[in-house]
Interface confidence: low
Amino acid sequence: DTEIKVNPPQDFEIVDPGYLGYLYLQWQPPLSLDHFKECTVEYELKYRNIGSETWKTIITKNLHYKDGFDLNKGIEAKIHTLLPWQCTNGSEVQSSWAETTYWISPQGIPETKVQDMDCVYYNWQYLLCSWKPGIGVLLDTNYNLFYWYEGLDHALQCVDYIKADGQNIGCRFPYLEASDYKDFYICVNGSSENKPIRSSYFTFQLQNIVKPLPPVYLTFTRESSCEIKLKWSIPLGPIPARCFDYEIEIREDDTTLVTATVENETYTLKTTNETRQLCFVVRSKVNIYCSDDGIWSEWSDKQCWEGEDLSKKTLLR
């Protein structure tokens, strides 16, 4: 019985199409596949950012694969050919590994890259990113931001920079069509006459960095002798009501502080007839049904009742 062997894929490479971290891994079939014409050859692909403890593993019949990477670090990948057991009378046969790496040659010392990059998607409508210049960089240094997400033909440069001292320290993005629930890639690079500037790469999903507007139209309604219903409305904008969580802060007679997190635009509060003053504020955040993370809105304007009979049907500011 001759041992069945198969070669690894040929021309295995990582290709950077200029999408700021979204890379193509591609390869060609192994040599000498003639013996296995009736067989569908598969490939096991493993890849990771250098320094990561775990490999991502994909088994595919295709000759390419695409995924996002952190270009601040290098990338390593390996692939081998798999012959399923149907082709080899009983046991799966694997080739040796073909390996490749990719990294962007870093320019400049790490301190020159932008510091404290912060991006917020205001009300699921307006993306704004800001940063601080690198440590010790000079006034002639300027930073440029580029971004890409699936659906754009190529990476775009920011067209509306926020400036301080003539330096770009942020970017106001234009309307970003069909940009949520997918990876959003950013590169901030820089130029200086005096020294090379290190580029920085960032990846996030827009729905996870949403800061909503605060709730509006806060009202009180007496439900019974010992219950008051607090109500508010969702703010204007594209975020549907089902996507909100709310946090309420309630003060009774300047002594009790109640905080609660609720999913609806109402909260029922137990009170006593002695309550002389009631105030509450609300803030909102995108919930786990619509995103993996989010940023609390600012607090709403305060709504207060004081000095009157709380049995009045509605108390509206």
């Epitope: 912060d118 000079l138 006034l139 002639d140 301080a164 005096n194």
Partner: antibody
Framework: QVQLQQPGAERVRPGASVKLSCKAS????????MNWVKQRPEQGLEWIGR????????HYNQKFKDKAILTVDKSSSTAYMQLRSLTSEDSAVYYC????????????WGQGTSVTVSS | DIVLTQSPASLAVSLGQRATISCRAS??????????MNWFQQKPGQPPKLLIY???RQGSGDPARFSGSGSGTDFSLNIHPLEEDDTAMYFC?????????FGGGTKLEIK
């Protein structure tokens, strides 16, 4: 190392003008703003304004808009502040201070020039 | 103009203890996620020396005994442990908008 050299003292008559100098060395002069700050004896600090030596752009505290004129001579890496129509209220120590940008603070200061206005 | 109010105006703290100086701005000095607040130390006959910039970042060559914190309108400078050499005036300064303004100063003495 970074140095900002200022004359120790100037004595001037009321109504006259004086031009204070600040000679920079140890760094690229045009890469940093030059700020000017006033300090009267036993009093606080007042920011007068700043100049970008690269482009000549100036930002003034409105309070000093008619009092101070900021200029630079790039060839000698020197910043100047001219004070005009001097009164006793202008008697103070005037510092020049290098600043990289709004969020970086004024990281190097001259020793200050003491201006005395008296007849 | 943004007014900065420092407190206390003076304080005396024992050697090795912690000194805390506060600075309150009449309006927020935050912008683009940055707090435009700086702290200076000034000794008699000397120019001010930058200790802290952007609210919490240390000036070059300053000892780790000096730390800054805060955002929006409320900021503080902490010095711990105090040394003899820390006797000085301390000023906060905002650089969010022109005109840049200083606090009135805090005189720190070592007991």
């Amino acid at each position: 190392q970074v140095q900002l050299q200022q004359p120790g003292a100037e004595r001037v008559r009321p109504g006259a003008s004086v031009k204070l100098s600040c000679k920079a060395s140890g760094y690229t002069f045009t890469n940093y703003w030059m700020n000017w700050v006033k300090q009267r004896p036993e009093q606080g600090l007042e920011w007068i304004g700043r100049i970008d030596p690269y482009a000549g752009e100036t930002h003034y505290n409105q309070k000093f808009k008619d009092k101070a004129i900021l200029t630079v001579d790039k060839s000698s890496s020197t910043a100047y502040m001219q004070l005009r129509s001097l009164t006793s209220e202008d008697s103070a120590v005037y510092y020049c201070a290098r600043g990289y940008g709004d969020s970086y603070g004024m990281d190097h200061w001259g020793q200050g020039t003491s201006v005395t206005v008296s007849s | 103009d943004i007014v900065l109010t420092q407190s206390p105006a003076s304080l005396a703290v024992s050697l090795g203890q912690r000194a805390t100086i506060s600075c309150r701005a009449s309006e927020s000095v935050d912008n683009y996620g940055i707090s435009f607040m700086n702290w200076f130390q000034q000794k008699p006959g000397q120019p001010p020396k930058l200790l802290i910039y952007a609210a919490s970042r240390q000036g070059s060559g300053d000892p780790a005994r000096f730390s800054g914190s805060g955002s929006g309108t409320d900021f503080s400078l902490n010095i711990h442990p105090l040394e003899e050499d820390d006797t000085a005036m301390y000023f906060c300064q905002q650089s969010k908008e022109v005109p840049w303004t200083f606090g009135g100063g805090t005189k720190l003495e070592i007991k």
